[in-house]
């Protein structure tokens, strides 16, 4: 095939609070193509209800996100004239707010020397087998790292962060989830900011 792989992204981001709007965008190499979006493992019926004029532009809006929208998506584009592109890299669309919020803390302290590392601990009141630590920024989408509990049957996950520098803000939240529904996360923990000295 000669059609380059498209890019799939979410606006304003891929980790979305339940009830909030989000738009999945697929962008390929040619203007005249049609776009297709699909969810891995389970058909996403919401996609079939998107107006054709938006589908043709590669826009797939969700006015109010629910658990039904969560999942791993890919897109492609093409036509009978030009064939079909390869599928995009996956986009994991996560819906938050499914469970009560966990607690995020820094060990031994949120005050860290420049160049140093710190342990962030995410604790849940209920036993979950999945945790995610998300780094937040003023003008950037959260970057999240998943982890399992540090011990079997535990409701705590441990994340190592660093080396840190004073040149940016170090803001974190964590989430808990059930690995059977890996795209449905808890409410976010309160924001934790690391204070970098030096």
């Amino acid at each position: 095939g000669h059609l380059p792989k498209p890019t799939l992204w979410a606006e304003p981001g891929s980790v979305i609070t339940q009830g909030s709007p989000v738009t999945l965008r697929c962008q390929g190499g040619q203007e005249t193509q049609e776009y297709r979006l699909y969810r891995e493992k389970k058909t996403a019926l919401w996609i079939t209800r998107i107006p054709q004029e938006l589908v043709k532009k590669g826009q797939f809006p969700i006015p109010s996100i629910t658990w039904e929208h969560a999942g791993r998506y890919r897109c492609y584009y093409g036509s009978d004239t030009a064939g079909r592109s390869e599928s995009s890299d996956p986009l994991e669309l996560v819906v938050t707010g499914a469970y009560i919020k966990p607690t995020l803390s820094a060990q031994p302290s949120p005050v860290v020397n420049s160049g140093g590392n710190v342990i962030l601990q995410c604790d849940s009141q209920v036993a979950f087998d999945g945790f995610s630590l998300c780094k937040e920024g003023e003008d950037e989408h959260p970057q999240c790292l998943n982890s399992q509990p540090h011990a079997r049957g535990s409701s705590r996950a441990i994340f190592s962060v660093g080396p840190v520098s004073p040149s940016r803000r170090w803001w974190y939240r964590c989430y808990a989830y059930d690995s059977n529904s890996p795209y449905e996360w808890s409410l976010p923990s309160d924001l934790l900011e690391l204070l970098v000295l030096g």
């Epitope: 095939g1 699909y38 891995e40 493992k41 093409g78 036509s79 004239t81 030009a82 064939g83 079909r84």
Partner: antibody, heavy 118, light 107 residues
């Protein structure tokens, strides 16, 4: 209505080349693709390749060195050429009209039987 | 390549029966599953695309279902003209691959 019809040599000697023509009607080769599929006697279906409306092609990786698909839009004909034939290329060869989004083949020719034998 | 497995190579049924033919993919194919019917004379027809979309002209007694890796084709009320071999095919990625086929015979 959409129709596809294959025509081939019937018998080809080993190491020779196979050429099959698929003549279509009811749709334009400038707008739609044509796919080739074969079926060895008593066995299942094997996808060989596709040529799209713009002339671009996709081939099965196992056959890419021996297979070429081309077309003549004005004559509504698609051509399959398979080189260096062996006895296990003996099969019924089908052309079909694929759709681009699900890669489903909506309409098929009746098939042409090819035997590779000396 | 994605392997498509039709574990039942032949199936015997009576006219009027409800018949289900199954197909399994070696990996998740996200509902990109098509079904074909091949008659004894070699004629091949598309029955269903994208798991459950009935192709034009196909009788409503045919239906498809499934998700992930497991799919099935159901004929709700078997008729004489349905005696044929049925193939599944994945359409998620190239190369396109087919199941080995399930031959439906009359009891």
């Amino acid at each position: 209505q959409v129709q596809l019809k294959e025509s081939g040599p019937g018998l080809v000697a080993p190491s020779q080349s196979l050429s099959i023509t698929c003549t279509v009607s009811g749709f334009s080769l400038t707008s739609y693709g044509v796919s080739w599929v074969r079926q060895p006697p008593g066995k299942g279906l094997e996808w060989l390749g596709i040529i799209w409306g713009d002339g671009s092609t996709n081939y099965h990786s196992a056959l890419v060195s021996r297979l070429s698909i081309s077309k003549d839009n004005s004559k509504s004909q698609v051509f399959l050429k398979l080189n260096s034939l062996q006895t296990d290329d003996t099969a019924t060869y089908y052309c079909a009209k694929p759709n681009w989004d699900y890669y489903a083949m909506d309409y098929w020719g009746q098939g042409t039987s090819v035997t590779v034998s000396s | 390549d994605i392997q498509m497995t039709q574990t039942t190579s032949s199936l015997s049924a009576s006219l009027g029966d409800r018949v289900t033919i199954s197909c399994r993919a070696s990996q998740d194919i996200s509902n990109y599953l098509n079904w074909y019917q091949q008659k004894v004379d070699g004629t091949v027809k598309l029955l269903i695309s994208y798991t459950s979309r009935l192709h034009s002209g196909v009788p409503s007694r045919f239906s498809g279902s499934g998700s992930g890796t497991d799919y099935s084709l159901t004929i709700s009320n078997l008729e004489q003209e349905d005696i044929a071999t049925y193939f599944c095919q994945q359409g998620i990625t190239l190369p396109l691959t087919f199941g080995a086929g399930t031959k439906l015979e009359l009891k």
